[in-house]
C-alpha cells in the first residue's frame, strides 16, 4: 500500500478541515485507511478520521477541527492498520479555503439595476467574518460568450448590476465565491447558481 | 457557546464518599478533556485528575486510590467520586475543559464543598 | 512533581500601572506555562497559554513572556476589572500543578 500524491489539506478556519490524498491503486477508503490528527501541543487529545473514497484511488478526510487560531499546527498521520504511510503536519492558518457564501438572490431594484445579495459564510465573532472579497460571474444562460466578473473588495456582500449592461430580455444566471486576502487564501466553491430574466428595455 | 456547570451535595460526613456532576454544553465530550481541580478555602488550586476525549482517565497520584472519574458521552456529563473524605478536602470543585495541550481553557463555577459532620 | 512558584503572594498597583506578576517552575518547562485570572466570585478564565499565546477574547493588555523556568505576566494598563488572584500553570507533564497565587490590589 503505498500514497501516490501526499495529503493536502484545506481549512474553512471555523469548524472543519478536509484533507485529500491519491493511493498507488484503487483503494476502499474507509475499510483500510486512517488519518490520524493531533494539536501539536503536549496533552492535546489524538483525533482518528475515517477518510471516503472521492475516486477510485482518491480518498478525502473530514475532521472537525475546533476554535482554530494563527498558531496552530497539526501532526497528521496516516495508517494502513499498522503501517504508517505517510507523516507530516498541517497549518490551518496557511491553508484556508473559506466556506461558501450562501443565499444568492437578485432583486430589481431603483434606477434600473439588479441587486445581488448572499449571506456571509461565517458569524461575526470569526476571524474571517470581516476578511473576506467576494468574485460574482454572471453569464447569459444562451450565450456562452457573454459573461461577466465582478470582484466585491468592499464589505457587504452586495453587488448593484445596471440592468443596462446585460442583454434586454435573456435570462441570467449569478454564482459568488469568496476569499481571504490576509490569510491568503485559495478561492471557495463556487455558490449554488441563481436565474433571472433581464426584462430591461433600453 | 461552551459551558461547564458542576452540583454537588454541599455538604458530606468525614469518612463518606463525594459525587460530583460536571454537566456540559456547546462542546462534545469525546472530542475533548475534562479536568477537575479544587481550591480550599483561602489556598490555591490543586489538580486532581482528568478523563481524555476517548475515556482514559489520568490522576494526581496523591489521590489515586480515593478518585475514580467517569463520563456520559451522550448526557455530555462527567462524574467525579472521591472517597473516604476528611475536613482537609473542604474546597471549592471545579471542572474544566481543555482543547490546547494542558491549558484549561474553560472553567465551570465551581461547587462548594464542606466536609464535616 | 514540579513545583511551581510564585514568590508574590499580594501586589498593590494604581489603574493604569503596568503590572508584572513572576512564576518559577523547579524544572524546565520547555514553554507550556499558561496564566490564569481568578475573580473574587471565584470565577475562573484562562489569559496566556504556552507562555504568551493570548487566548482568544483576552483584551491584549495582557502579555506573557519567559523561558526554561522563569515566566512571566504583564498587564500593560491597569485597569479596573483586573483586580483578581493570577495563578500560574505548567502544562508539561502530569500532574498539571499551580503556583500558589498573586492577589492584585488597588493602591
Known amino acids: 500500500v503505498k500514497v501516490l500524491h501526499e495529503p493536502s489539506c484545506f481549512s474553512d478556519y471555523i469548524s472543519t478541515s478536509v484533507c485529500q490524498w491519491k493511493m498507488d491503486h484503487p483503494t476502499n477508503c474507509s475499510a483500510e485507511l486512517r488519518l490520524s490528527y493531533q494539536l501539536d501541543f503536549m496533552g492535546s487529545e489524538n483525533h482518528t478520521c475515517v477518510p471516503e473514497n472521492r475516486e477510485d484511488s482518491v480518498c478525502v478526510c473530514s475532521m472537525p477541527i475546533d476554535d482554530a487560531v494563527e498558531a496552530d499546527v497539526y501532526q497528521l498521520d496516516l495508517w494502513a492498520g499498522q503501517q504508517l504511510l505517510w507523516s507530516g503536519s498541517f497549518q490551518p492558518s496557511k491553508h484556508v479555503k473559506p466556506r461558501t457564501p450562501g443565499n444568492l438572490t437578485v432583486h430589481p431594484n431603483i434606477s434600473h439595476t439588479w441587486l445581488l445579495m448572499w449571506t456571509n459564510p461565517y458569524p461575526t465573532e470569526n476571524h474571517l467574518h470581516s476578511e473576506l472579497t467576494y468574485m460574482v460571474n454572471v453569464s447569459n444562460d444562451n450565450d456562452p460568450e457573454d459573461f461577466k466578473v465582478y470582484n466585491v473588495t468592499y464589505m457587504g456582500p452586495t453587488l448593484r448590476l445596471a440592468a443596462s449592461t446585460l442583454k434586454s430580455g435573456a435570462s441570467y444566471s449569478a454564482r459568488v465565491r469568496a476569499w481571504a486576502q490576509t490569510y491568503n487564501s485559495t478561492w471557495s466553491d463556487w455558490s449554488p447558481s441563481t436565474t433571472w430574466l433581464n426584462y430591461y428595455e433600453p | 457557546q461552551v459551558q461547564l456547570k458542576e452540583s454537588g451535595p454541599g455538604l458530606v460526613a468525614p469518612s463518606q464518599s463525594l459525587s460530583i456532576t460536571c454537566t456540559v454544553s456547546g462542546f462534545s465530550l469525546s472530542r475533548y478533556s475534562v479536568h477537575w481541580v479544587r481550591q480550599p478555602p483561602g489556598k490555591g488550586l490543586e489538580w486532581l485528575g482528568m478523563i481524555w476525549g476517548g475515556g482514559s482517565t489520568d490522576y494526581n497520584s496523591v489521590f489515586k486510590s480515593r478518585l475514580s472519574i467517569s463520563k456520559d458521552n451522550s448526557k455530555s456529563q462527567v462524574f467525579l467520586k472521591m472517597n473516604s473524605l476528611q475536613t482537609d478536602d473542604t474546597a471549592m470543585y471545579y471542572c474544566?475543559?481543555?482543547?490546547?495541550?494542558?491549558?484549561?481553557?474553560?472553567w465551570g463555577q465551581g461547587t462548594s464543598v464542606t466536609v464535616s459532620s | 512533581d514540579i513545583q511551581m512558584t510564585q514568590t508574590t503572594s499580594s501586589l498593590s498597583a494604581s489603574l493604569g500601572d503596568r503590572v508584572t506578576i513572576s512564576c518559577r517552575a523547579s524544572q524546565d518547562i520547555s514553554n507550556y506555562l499558561n496564566w490564569y485570572q481568578q475573580k473574587p466570585d471565584g470565577t475562573v478564565k484562562l489569559l496566556i497559554y504556552?507562555?504568551?499565546r493570548l487566548q482568544s477574547g483576552v483584551p491584549s493588555r495582557f502579555s506573557g513572556s519567559g523561558s526554561g523556568t522563569d515566566y512571566c505576566l504583564t498587564i500593560s494598563n491597569l485597569e479596573q476589572e483586573d483586580i483578581a488572584t493570577y495563578f500560574c500553570?505548567?502544562?508539561?507533564?502530569?500532574?498539571?500543578?499551580f503556583g500558589s497565587g498573586t492577589k492584585l490590589e488597588l493602591k
Open positions: 474544566a475543559r481543555t482543547y490546547r495541550g494542558y491549558a484549561l481553557d474553560y
Open positions: 504556552y507562555t504568551s
Open positions: 500553570q505548567q502544562a508539561n507533564t502530569l500532574p498539571l500543578t
